[in-house]
Amino acid sequence: AWELTILHTNDVHSRLEQTSEDSSKCVNASRCMGGVARLFTKVQQIRRAEPNVLLLDAGDQYQGTIWFTVYKGAEVAHFMNALRYDAMALGNHEFDNGVEGLIEPLLKEAKFPILSANIKAKGPLASQISGLYLPYKVLPVGDEVVGIVGYTSKETPFLSNPGTNLVFEDEITALQPEVDKLKTLNVNKIIALGHSGFEMDKLIAQKVRGVDVVVGGHSNTFLYTGNPPSKEVPAGKYPFIVTSDDGRKVPVVQAYAFGKYLGYLKIEFDERGNVISSHGNPILLNSSIPEDPSIKADINKWRIKLDNYSTQELGKTIVYLDGSSQSCRFRECNMGNLICDAMINNNLRHTDEMFWNHVSMCILNGGGIRSPIDERNNGTITWENLAAVLPFGGTFDLVQLKGSTLKKAFEHSVHRYGQSTGEFLQVGGIHVVYDLSRKPGDRVVKLDVLCTKCRVPSYDPLKMDEVYKVILPNFLANGGDGFQMIKDELLRHDSGDQDINVVSTYISKMKVIYPAVEGRIKFSTGSH
């Protein structure tokens, strides 16, 4: 028997520095977690103690904090090189700055293979990107070899900016021939490493012949055997065992997100490459694990630029950006409109001629808007200003909801109106009319939504049974501010870009902004 230790991360999302327990900015260092310096300590400890160790990343290193905003992926390559990752799969967010923003900072700089078997380049890009990412890589580990085959969510064109010269194929269809190729090369221990979410991970384990282990990402899935060490609730045991169609027991793992945990899986193979046993658990990277001093020093060196960046002008406003709770929790506020407009703008993807865009709607809890921005400071808007408006380090995500769920959400928005509560919704691509004289749960008297399958966008009444795409904060997607119906009834949820980054990019693009209050949210009394 031969034993392999798989260390794995996924959806790190730019958390290079240690964070608080909820993966936001570290405030009290003695209670902070994660970060590459602490990760390195643990990885090195395991490398010294165990003979056959692989360190893998399942994608979405890109996007999530000011580190990515400033360094645009160079920080990912630099610190992953420093940690000596063995392989990485491409995630959807690796395409956030286009193919160019993947090639130059990451693919060019990485000293480890970057993988995806289901992304195929065509046209002029094919020769430019040839060899920069691979469908698979055979890695020597001790006296043996291990094949790593990569995959990426085929939804990436809807979630990011991969351009028109990359084709995202079905994961299972693309993986099988690559695994078969590895088998012909006499590689009998094969790990599928990828970024398509837990459901697809399980399908790959079930359907792709020859895959021994699946290491996934995208769905931020937390698996744990026994009593979990922090706040995350396990979606299943670690590893999650799937019985493949050909009768094998295939371990599937994921390690939550944000570098909070290091996935730790021990696999025992027989001489023919069959998995005999698998066990492990994610390791919580809490403050009991010291930060490696040399990596920490490097982080501090790179940090300097971030402080400079946060005070630079992004653009100007010529109007007061009303982000006060007195406005945003009671009525339409222009800060809400600005943020929603930025959210839609960030999700412009012309992937189908029938649609002007795949999504037109935005909702945003008024309680998530934490500060106004005064235009009388020469109109200057900085990252620092936006961090005061959006201080929670969330993301703006893409969900699919039925019209009936949206209707419930808007009823919830005003179910206890007047108490300055955070659930009052700001909107984009939606016209809503409330009648507060009616009883809670029956106050939405008009709800019109902007069409997507149209050449001239216009507002049509919401259809209860239709499925709509909506951009919203991850806080709402997770049922925050009492929006349990969104969490319970959403049909799909893909995590998006860092909230501040979305707004800062929009302001930089527009240069001068002047959002208005324009009748997106109205109140009426009496009949309609």
């Epitope: 645009k72 160079a74 630099h78 130059e104 900072p105 060019k108 700089e109 000293k111 002029p124 040839s130």
Partner: antibody, heavy 123, light 108 residues
Framework: EVQLVESGGGLVQPGGSLRLSCAAS????????MHWVRQAPGKGLEWVSG????????DYADSVKGRFTISRDNSKNTLYLQMNSLRAEDTAVYYC????????????????WGQGTLVTVSS | DIQMTQSPSSLSASVGDRVTITCRAS??????LAWYQQKPGKAPKLLIY???SLESGVPSRFSGSGSGTDFTLTISSLQPEDFATYYC??????????FGQGTKVEIK
């Protein structure tokens, strides 16, 4: 306007020393790797040395290793090349060049070049 | 070190001609190749990076192709201002930068 201006060239005897400077303007100097490239009279281009944006990675051509030292002062937007133990074969126009990629640690293409400064090593 | 070999070392052409210069690397360098133009007494100017990407401000008559070891710079219709010396340069990861010996494009 993005600009690189070299200075410090001149006539020096074999075994002597010279310090070249390159003043940068019009771009955020400390975002980019910088390089020295030279061109002997009537000959082609030869890369001499490079330094990454935060001075962590420094490289030299074998022909100058141990004799030349590249450095940068990001607060002054200036790149330097300290040349010691100069030889006749070091005679060339020395160009300062900027890497086109931000924060790179590995080799890149050079999108901005200075006008060059002539170094003549002769007795 | 990786050697870069350009051919031809010089060529004569007329305004309006299609001109092709090739560059061969002694080992695989992926797409990490740049092309520069240099006029007498002037600094080189970047034309193409990553084998085929046109630097901003460079006329579209210049194009690059190739990957691996064999690369080509094409000027689709030679203009009077294009008479110069052209250099290729490899910048493959973690190996020193090396230039080709140059190709001089002269008026026929």
């Amino acid at each position: 306007e993005v600009q690189l201006v070299e200075s410090g060239g001149g006539l020096v005897q074999p075994g002597g020393s010279l310090r070249l400077s390159c003043a940068a303007s019009g771009f955020t100097f400390d975002d980019y790797a910088m390089h020295w490239v030279r061109q002997a009279p009537g000959k082609g281009l030869e890369w001499v040395s490079g330094i990454n944006w935060n001075s962590d990675n420094i490289d030299y051509a074998d022909s100058v290793k141990g004799r030349f030292t590249i450095s940068r002062d990001n607060s002054k937007n200036t790149l330097y090349l300290q040349m010691n133990s100069l030889r006749a074969e070091d005679t060339a126009v020395y160009y300062c060049a900027k890497d086109r990629r931000k924060y790179s640690n590995s080799p890149g293409a050079f999108d901005i070049w200075g006008q060059g400064t002539l170094v003549t090593v002769s007795s | 070190d990786i050697q870069m070999t350009q051919s031809p070392s010089s060529l004569s052409a007329s305004v309006g001609d299609r001109v092709t210069i090739t560059c061969r690397a002694s080992q695989i360098i992926g797409p990490w190749l740049a092309w520069y133009q240099q006029k007498p007494g002037k600094a080189p100017k970047l034309l193409i990076y990553r084998a085929s990407s046109l630097e901003s401000g460079v006329p579209s008559r210049f194009s690059g192709s190739g990957s691996g070891t064999d690369f080509t710079l094409t000027i689709s219709s030679l203009q009077p201002e294009d008479f110069a010396t052209y250099y290729c340069q490899q910048y493959n990861s973690y190996s020193p930068w090396t230039f080709g010996q140059g190709t001089k494009v002269e008026i026929k």
